[in-house]
């Protein structure tokens, strides 16, 4: 015989849910022991079935969860699972919190990317933060010509993808440019994107050729000379 | 040819459900988030929900939270409205509108394509 | 929410003369990256919306040069230079910054 154990407790690490009001919750407490345990869910401490909830809710005990659909406010509190058996028992709490603020287009930071100069063969860092409540996918472009042209007969502009990332709000995306070449130079778009629409920011990179070690060596005298 | 078809609209009696449907076709569905967009008989246009390129975000008008749910197949490309405890104000024209999209925007980035849409009567 | 105030509620024009319709927002529609996001539309009767102007100012693609957007930040103007027959219909304006998505009451085109 064993007491009530958790079998998958590196997915109950997020404690906390904040979701958009509307969205599905799940919360998930996979366990064993022997004999074979039960659960069952509490909310803010006290039994919990759904009855009072529109929508109510699915339990799948076999799969140790309960799921919500079209969360409201009313939904916010605190989820325990109770695991037991004859011979003991576990408990976890899950926190819910629904934003009911507005979900918006992304915006980004102003000022970045910013417009940098390189030095053929250096390393080049162009940045994007970006703030959204909806998760936002992020694009890196560089504009292109094609065919001696910067512009599509649409009058739109020839972008090539460089990197395509999908980031938690507020987190910084930051497009990496190794041992830059003359051909690097030009214009590079962030592009964010969420449910709501898309933002974009554009920079310039210019890119100079490798300095001339005589010219280096002069350079601090020159700074000086009228 | 871009086109969006709804269906699944009809008469029902307040407290009672319907499941709405678009079919998209003629672009990437999987690539754009997708809304619906109602319009009661004679009056106004009120948005209702929005849900992301591949259904992980959703959001809804505080008139239907709770009572409807946007889901898409994007295996099928097909959007769905499933509206439950509906009311006699849910009465309208209901439209599929294709969103956002990912990549740089060659025009607006959403609301260009709406449906034709389809009647929802709820009555007693 | 973001409200879309409509003004006038309809409008009769004479073909061939102007015709304007404004539409006033509750919070600025300029966004972060420099765009103003108000989209206009017109809806013929039995028909869904049309596009007609985007991110303030742009033609939609097919939409005629006598239609024009216009505007910034709050307040915001639809110009139809000549108004021609098949013009007719319900005007809107929409706020895409944030969600809920809000509509103008809408505006009501005759011909005289």
């Known amino acids: 015989q064993q007491a009530p154990y958790w079998t998958h407790p590196q997915r109950m690490e997020k404690k906390l849910h904040a979701v958009p009001a509307g969205n599905t919750v799940k919360f998930r407490c996979p366990a064993a022991g022997n004999p074979t345990p039960t659960i069952r869910w509490l909310k803010d401490g006290q039994a919990f079935h759904g009855e009072n909830r529109i929508g109510g809710i699915r339990l799948r005990h076999q799969h140790w969860s309960l799921v919500m659909e079209s969360v409201v406010p009313s939904d916010r509190g605190t989820y325990t699972c109770l695991v037991e058996n004859a011979v003991g028992s576990i408990r976890y709490n899950y926190l819910l919190d629904v934003l009911e603020r507005s979900p918006h287009r992304p915006i980004l930071q102003a000022g970045l990317p910013a417009n940098t100069t390189a030095v053929v063969g250096s390393d080049v860092e162009l940045l994007c933060k970006v703030y959204s409540d909806a998760q936002p996918h992020i694009q890196w472009l560089k504009h292109i010509v094609i065919n001696g042209s910067s512009f599509g007969a649409d009058g739109f502009p020839y972008v090539q993808v460089l990197k395509t990332a999908d980031i938690n709000s507020s987190e910084v995306e930051v497009l990496y440019l190794r041992n830059v070449s003359a051909e690097d130079a030009g214009e590079y778009t962030c592009l964010a994107g969420n449910s709501i629409g898309l933002s974009y920011q554009s920079a310039w990179l210019t890119v100079l050729p490798e300095e001339d070690p005589t010219w280096t060596a002069a350079a601090p005298e020159a700074r000086y000379t009228d | 040819e871009v086109q969006l078809l709804e269906s699944g609209g009809g008469v029902v009696q307040p407290g009672r459900s319907l499941r709405l449907s678009c079919a998209a076709s003629g672009f990437t569905f999987s690539s754009y988030a997708m809304h619906w967009v109602r319009q009661a008989p004679g009056k106004g246009l009120e948005w209702v929900a929005v849900i992301s390129y591949d259904g992980s975000n959703k959001y809804y008008a505080d008139s239907v939270k709770g009572r409807f749910t946007i889901s898409r197949d994007n295996s099928k490309n097909t959007l769905s409205l499933q509206m439950n405890s509906l009311r006699v104000e849910d009465t309208a024209i209901y439209y599929c509108?294709?969103?956002?999209?990912?990549?740089?925007?060659?025009?607006?980035?959403?609301?260009?394509?709406w449906g034709q849409g389809t009647m929802v009567t709820v009555s007693s | 929410d973001i409200v879309m105030t409509q003004t006038p509620l309809s409008l009769s024009v004479t073909p061939g003369q102007p015709a304007s319709i404004s539409c006033r927002s509750s919070?600025?529609?300029?966004?972060?990256?420099?765009?103003?996001?108000v989209y206009w539309y017109v809806q013929k009767s039995g028909q869904p919306p049309q596009l007609l102007i985007y991110e303030l100012s742009n033609r939609f693609s097919g939409v005629p040069d006598r239609f024009s957007g216009s505007g910034s930040r709050t307040d915001f103007t639809l110009k139809i230079s000549r108004v021609e027959a098949e013009d007719v219909g319900v005007y809107y304006c929409?706020?895409?910054?944030?969600?809920?998505?809000?509509f103008g009451g809408g505006t009501k085109v005759e011909i005289k």
């Open positions: 509108v294709r969103g956002a999209g990912h990549g740089f925007p060659t025009g607006p980035d959403g609301f260009d394509i």
């Open positions: 929409m706020q895409y910054v944030e969600a809920p998505l809000t």
């Open positions: 919070r600025s529609l300029l966004h972060s990256d420099g765009k103003t996001y």
